[in-house]
């Protein structure tokens, strides 16, 4: 790479003469932090993204960058401002010595600094068969709407846009931000440079092998001929999309990020900002046979993160590695031997594998759904993707044991009809990160901004937990789980639902004095019970079992252990009705389940009693699962008796609205 530092000298001389006796300390009370990639070989020291506080204006960003240069020059260091960010995140990209980090962190307006790092392409015709509903035949796959109202942005390698499969469907933008290829003897062969991006463009919108044949695409080059890019280049690409969106607002936008790098706070933040501007982002979970939460943008909650499965709906193995998994994955999609456009010739096809291909499928499905319903929000789209997925078809034995419960058993599918899902009450399960093992450790699960938290539960592999509670945080309810002394940590599990015009609140009853157990109900007129939680301060609740689980005629009531505080989630929404469904097993059993029937949606899942041998409760699709300790380790059979309690809801209002539309 030719050194671009030739103009440093001139710049520094100009800066030396500048008046720069400015305060070096940041505003009091705040400390800027430094972040770098946890994967050492992927680090790119010497280039840093300086992220400024949210309300910082462009002029302040430029001034802060100049100040850094001037102060560095005073200390005899050369620096170069490579890019000033605005539109998505305020900040700048600077090439400088790591010795200057301490100085940079003290600059006014600085929120945090992140060292640049690498991102990588994630690739190694049954695919249409799998995502096509049974009433279509894959060999004559003509979707009802080809995504023609939607624009899909692809951030990838260069592409062969005149390939017959994608010609006229893809516009190559002039955006390019890629690192130099590694190795002195690297030979740039156009067809190899274009391979990854061309294939993915074909999977999204190809005329023969594409999912959304009507979708138009725009490509940005952020990966070089070796499929390698940088976090900073990806950030600048995302900023380019946001600016394009502001200059020329079009219909719905989908952004496909078929790449992954190590966990990046700044890349996740940029994705969050773009998502909150109404853009749907779809990304590859990663091909590292690892927890997707350790990678970006896969770990960004606002992004739809896609793992890869094969023709048998099994997780894809890629050499010694394979698809990523875990709570940061939203769903899986076809990602093995996917046929698509090959850059070897203008009519060639090739099969490629990886979570990039899986993400491209979901981007195509998203384009179809948005074309049919352009007003869908990101939360509505994600809920629909989950709702229409094939459930429980993946063999979970492939995943590490501790990740099985966290990984969604969902394979993406097109809805049988792109309209008419509006009447459904959609809910999904969101797992928190693990709390860690300290006595007072907690874990928090959050819903998306336009979702309602309808219930909260917790889970601990050791069974040592102190329950969970719903609490307000920044004007929104969150689900917090509490670890117990000697516990290995807990998870909080939120049930996040789409409930328009909802008014939800939490009613709490403190631990009861009497031996009847604790009860709490929804006493406000028109409010219905959507979920029950219980939280206790004692280390071990013991074996107390309330004599009456739920008095007849009082469905709006939560019941729990007398030493626990009980929390009822009570909601008012037009036409919302809920009912409680219980399944109790007198003998000890490791798992008890109860499911909501057709037409009803699971909103709440809890266990009775809340004793310490219960590991926790969580929702899997429309089924409430209560897990207990291994039967052989539990004491008496009376202690082993467990009841799974499901709260099932439906919205007559949504059903009526849907019928009126039809």
């Amino acid at each position: 790479q030719e050194d671009e530092d030739g103009d440093y000298e001139e710049l520094v001389l100009a800066l030396r003469s500048e008046e720069d006796g400015l305060a070096e300390a940041p505003e009091h009370g705040t400390t800027a932090t430094f972040h770098r990639c946890a994967k050492d070989p992927w680090r790119l020291p010497g280039t840093y993204v300086v992220v400024l506080k949210e309300e910082t204006h462009l002029s302040q960003s430029e001034r802060t960058a100049r100040r850094l240069q001037a102060q560095a020059a005073r200390r005899g260091y050369l620096t170069k401002i490579l890019h000033v960010f605005h539109g998505l995140l305020p900040g700048f990209l600077v090439k400088m010595s790591g010795d200057l980090l301490e100085l940079a962190l003290k600059l006014p307006h600085v929120d945090y600094i992140e060292e640049d790092s690498s991102v990588f392409a994630q690739s190694i015709p049954w695919n249409l068969e799998r995502i096509t509903p049974p009433r279509y035949r894959a060999d004559e796959y003509q979707p009802p709407d080809g995504g023609s109202l939607v624009e899909v942005y692809l951030l990838d390698t260069s592409i062969q846009s005149d390939h017959r499969e994608i010609e006229g469907r893809v516009m190559v933008t002039d955006f390019e931000n890629v690192p130099e290829e590694d190795g002195t003897r690297f030979h740039r062969q156009a067809s190899k440079c274009d391979s990854h991006g061309t294939h993915l463009a074909g999977v999204v919108s190809g005329r023969d092998a594409g999912v959304a044949k009507g979708a138009s695409m725009r490509s940005l080059r952020v990966l070089n001929c070796q499929g390698k890019g940088t976090v900073s280049g990806t950030l600048i690409g995302l900023e380019f999309i946001r600016k394009s969106q502001l200059v020329q607002p079009v219909g719905p936008l989908v952004v496909l990020l078929p790449l992954a790098g190590g966990y990046s706070r700044v890349l996740n933040a940029a994705c969050q900002r773009l998502a909150r501007a109404g853009v749907v982002l779809v990304t590859a979970a990663g091909n590292f046979r690892d927890d997707a939460c350790l990678y970006s943008p896969a770990s960004a909650p606002e992004v739809i993160t896609v793992g890869a499965t094969n023709a048998q709906d099994q997780p894809v193995t890629l050499g010694t590695l394979g698809t990523n998994f875990g709570r940061c994955v939203d769903l899986f999609a076809p990602g093995e031997d996917i046929i698509g456009a090959s850059s070897d010739c203008s009519t060639c096809f090739v099969s490629q594998s990886g979570t990039s291909q899986a993400a491209a499928h979901v981007a195509g499905i998203a384009a179809m759904m948005l074309s049919a319903e352009p007003e869908l929000t990101l939360a509505e789209l994600r809920q629909r993707l989950i709702h229409f997925s094939a459930k429980d078809v993946i063999n979970e034995a492939w995943f590490p044991e501790d990740q099985r419960v966290l990984t969604p058993n969902l394979v993406a599918a097109l809805p049988p009809s792109t309209h008419g899902a509006g009447w459904q009450l959609f809910c999904r399960t969101v797992w928190s990160a693990h709390s860690g093992p300290t006595r007072m450790a907690t874990a928090v699960a959050r819903c998306a901004p336009d979702e309602e938290l309808l219930s909260c539960s917790s889970f601990s592999r050791s069974g040592k937990r102190r329950g969970e509670r719903m609490e307000a945080q920044g004007g929104k309810l969150v689900c917090r789980a509490h670890n117990a002394f000697g516990g290995e940590g807990v998870y909080a599990i939120a049930r996040c639902c789409l409930l328009p015009q909802a008014n939800c609140s939490v009613h709490t009853a403190p631990p009861a004095e009497a031996s009847m157990g604790t009860r709490v109900h929804c006493h406000q007129q028109g409010h219905v019970l959507t979920g029950c939680s219980s939280h206790w301060e004692v280390e071990d609740l013991g074996t107390h079992k309330p004599p009456v689980l739920r008095p007849r005629g009082q469905p709006n009531q939560c019941v729990g252990h007398r030493e626990a505080s009980i929390h009822a989630s009570c909601c008012h929404a037009p036409g919302l009705e809920c009912k409680v469904k219980e399944h109790g097993i007198p003998a000890p059993q490791e798992q008890v389940t109860v499911a909501c029937e057709e037409g009803w949606t699971l909103t709440g899942c809890s266990a009775l009693p809340g004793t310490s041998h219960v590991l926790g409760a969580y929702a899997v699709d429309n089924t409430c699962v209560v897990r207990s300790r291994d039967v052989s380790t539990t004491g008496s059979t009376s202690e082993g008796a467990v009841t799974a309690v499901a709260i099932c809801c439906r919205s007559r209002h949504l059903a009526q609205a849907s019928q009126e539309l039809q």
Partner: antibody, heavy 115, light 107 residues
């Protein structure tokens, strides 16, 4: 607006070569290749091949293999079709069209092969 | 190569008539069929692509239908400027192949 402008009519002797040009404008040339189609007097349309502005790749009809060469010059947004060893049955109007989709056509270039 | 057969090879009609031209492929081409209109001394003009989709600027009186092997071009009410030769073309396989054409003449 999309325009394809072709070179003028040619009269050639059997055995000679002809090179027809097609200048593209009004769209991003790298997103589409150029197809060449010919039409003999009073006859139907026959696809001859395709050439890429992006990387110069070609895709020829079997009938043309060895006798025809298609090239592009992206700097001038021009595509070329050269036909060698001309025979009288090569007398036709030669059209260029945008891409495989052939949604826009040039005005045509008449090539007459006569001794 | 896929063979395309058009019928009739020519037809006479009056202004205002409804005209139907059919095209048959020697094997299934799904919906990858285009229709072109060509006037004497002019280049062909794309009328319909993917069996039934009209490009912008093409009058709504032109419509296409069919899939698999049998396709139809319909002109709902023939106008004076519609007298021309119409070609179908399959876009399923390389090489693309054309029908022999249907000449629509004034009665």
């Amino acid at each position: 607006q999309v325009q394809l402008v072709q070179s003028g009519a040619e009269v050639k002797k059997p055995g000679a070569s002809v090179k027809v040009s097609c200048k593209a404008s009004g769209y991003a040339i790298y997103n589409y290749g150029i197809s060449w189609v010919r039409q003999a007097p009073g006859q139907g349309l026959e696809w001859m091949g395709w050439v890429s502005f992006y990387n110069g790749n070609t895709n020829y009809a079997q009938k043309l293999q060895g006798r025809g060469t298609m090239t592009t010059d992206p700097s001038t947004s021009t595509a070329y079709m050269e036909l060698r060893s001309l025979r009288s049955d090569d007398t036709a109007v030669y059209y260029c069209a945008r891409g495989y989709v052939m949604d826009f056509w040039g005005q045509g270039t008449t090539v007459t092969v006569s001794s | 190569d896929i063979q395309m057969t058009q019928s009739p090879s020519s037809l006479s009609a009056s202004v205002g008539d409804r005209v139907t031209i059919t095209c048959r492929a020697s094997q299934s081409i799904n919906n990858w069929l285009d229709w072109y209109q060509q006037k004497p001394g002019k280049a062909p003009k794309l009328l319909i692509y993917a069996a039934s989709t009209r490009p912008s600027g093409v009058p709504s009186r032109f419509s296409g239908s069919g899939s698999g092997t049998d396709f139809t071009l319909t002109i709902s009410s023939l106008q004076p400027e519609d007298f021309a030769t119409y070609y179908c073309q399959q876009d399923q396989d390389i090489p693309p192949t054309f029908g022999q054409g249907t000449k629509v003449e004034i009665k």
